[in-house]
Amino acid sequence: EICGPGIDIRNDYQQLKRLENCTVIEGYLHILLISKAEDYRSYRFPKLTVITEYLLLFRVAGLESLGDLFPNLTVIRGWKLFYNYALVIFEMTNLKDIGLYNLRNITRGAIRIEKNADLCYLSTVDWSLILDAVSNNYIVGNKPPKECGDLCPGTMEEKPMCEKTTINNEYNYRCWTTNRCQKMCPSTCGKRACTENNECCHPECLGSCSAPDNDTACVACRHYYYAGVCVPACPPNTYRFEGWRCVDRDFCANILSAESSDSEGFVIHDGECMQECPSGFIRNGSQSMYCIPCEGPCPKVCEEEKKTKTIDSVTSAQMLQGCTIFKGNLLINIRRGNNIASELENFMGLIEVVTGYVKIRHSHALVSLSFLKNLRLILGEEQLEGNYSFYVLDNQNLQQLWDWDHRNLTIKAGKMYFAFNPKLCVSEIYRMEEVTGTKGRQSKGDINTRNNGERASCESDVLHFTSTTTSKNRIIITWHRYRPPDYRDLISFTVYYKEAPFKNVTEYDGQDACGSNSWNMVDVDLPPNKDVEPGILLHGLKPWTQYAVYVKAVTLTMVENDHIRGAKSEILYIRTNASVPSIPLDVLSASNSSSQLIVKWNPPSLPNGNLSYYIVRWQRQPQDGYLYRHNYCSKDKIPIRKYADGTIDIEEVTENPKTEVCGGEKGPCCACPKTEAEKQAEKEEAEYRKVFENFLHNSIFVPRPE
């Protein structure tokens, strides 16, 4: 029986019964978030031989081995992967061994086995026999091999039953558990699979087979499965499906994607039955199951039944994802939102043509319209009262329309209207008139020169910083006192600052007017003494952190066309001083001889500067009697040693130690300091771990169905 499309077993271990009759899971298998430790011994699914996508195990309490659950799982095809992985075993608290002793092939993707505190028998499995490439495997944070004492069958009795292979220059026995060897086929079979009796399978078999050289006796197929036979390609009038089997036209014509609420149906393209036409192709008509190439970017026409589509949230914008032509009018009314500009670009960034009008009103969350990054034509087939096809009203934070140096937008019919956009300079509007070809269409009142740009520094002088002083969590800055033509019109200054690891921020960064990542603002009153330069103490800052700072003058002065003449500084980058680091992380100690301890730790999460050395303290403690009671010949886990905590100081310099020639009487060498490349690799590794964990959590924690 083919089960699917993807099976998610969570919360209740009894859901495992869903796997009872499955021989192939067409899709993924998730077993996760079972927090109550259960006895899984009564659950056994010997019929399951193939998973076409991936297997994910996460936080299943009480499960000690997968061998009893899936004794015959032979192939994980990896047709779709979980973050590049076909097998993920993550935070399985009680898992002692993987035990999938019949797993012979992972066709695509790597494995990730991480943070399984009790998991052993990892170094005894030769993954190169199962996967084509092992370089992308990620096996970290499991039980240390030294604490495992992994023994393959027969080793204790000195009658080893398993075969040996070499991994990392270590020639050793290969097994899954204390009583299950890793199966290897005779070298005469080459890349072919073999039976339990070491007879070579048919070349089209994958993993194993029940009879030699027979394409109907395969456990799984190397290429495709059709009508009980493994075939190298799908026969005529059948089509590849889900990467492993052949289906007929009738099957493909009647299936729908479960991931969509539409009923668009699958298509046949290039001999495959697939959910949608591939990139660069479009369906050949509404009733067609076939794809034809697009001329240029594939058009997607979207139509609003009520003629006007109101975009007032990310959710409403989502409906326009992938649309290139919008038949109707766009009314944009974004008052608030999180990360709104990039979300809107994601969903509306492909729109090239709007057949009606575009109206942007009360969109206080918008700083720019650049999220419509491909808009090139507004046809104006339908216009607002007064013959307007581009209407911009009361957008309190709108400062930029588009980057006109890189934008070609045409408004075919209709006029433009701008009013009550206090931060939008009129020069920006005039530039749009020129680019869009609407110059001369607007009447005098259509572009209001009084209330557009009234709160923007549209003609700015430059403020210069005069001094900067830093401490570990403070910055003091002063700047030249700005002297406008009429000194009474200088009201105050506003200082903007934010963390800036790189010197690449701009004034508009993070300004969707609601965003949590926008600039911090501090108002600075004028010093009463006209000769004193204005300044500010920024406090509560982080040590050893680069900040970007700029200052704006708040003025009343008007020039002849009713615009503020303002002043602002360039962006200044300044770093706070170093401070005491936070405590080192993950301190571990182990003994490698009768007179030595090796102590390891990770750097502090907040170094607050460039670390120069660590201080290590230790003290002698009485021997723990428990150590004498433990039988070290048993295969149970060895007790974890207590970590050292000490009193005697050692100063370990982390800067490059003096290089000395090793050997002779000199004694052991110091470990070479890490190169920049190694440090960078470690940093990337830590980042990658976080990204994967976030991906995992975001993928599996879903709202409870209604």
């Epitope: 993807g6 299936i255 479960a258 991931e259 609420s261 539409d262 009733q287 409906m319």
Partner: nanobody, 128 residues
Amino acid sequence: EVQLVESGGGLVQPGGSLRLSCAASGLTFGTFGMAWFRQAPGKEREGVSAISASSGRTYYADSVKGRFTISRDNSKNTLYLQMNSLRAEDTAVYYCAVRSKNGAGYGFWYEARLYGYWGQGTLVTVSS
């Protein structure tokens, strides 16, 4: 709240015609695939016909191909089923259903699990 109200059922002679309507409210009608199902007394519910939202692609059960036509009017939020050449075996309660997202993978258009909202049904009786 999504509501689906079927109408147009009734008694008709074999060979006759009927037009069923399904008025939908509480959803953005133009973005959802829709279908007609039917359930004859003592039998399982079966798919009759389905239609997509974006392109209007249609699907029919073999037993009704050439006799029934599904259509939709997005401006009126209404789904239709034109039934011609009716037979006694078409007697059933006809239900209107709206697609819903149902996790990963695929399903056949006539699988009830792919549909998240259902109407109360309208009875069609074909008898002489």
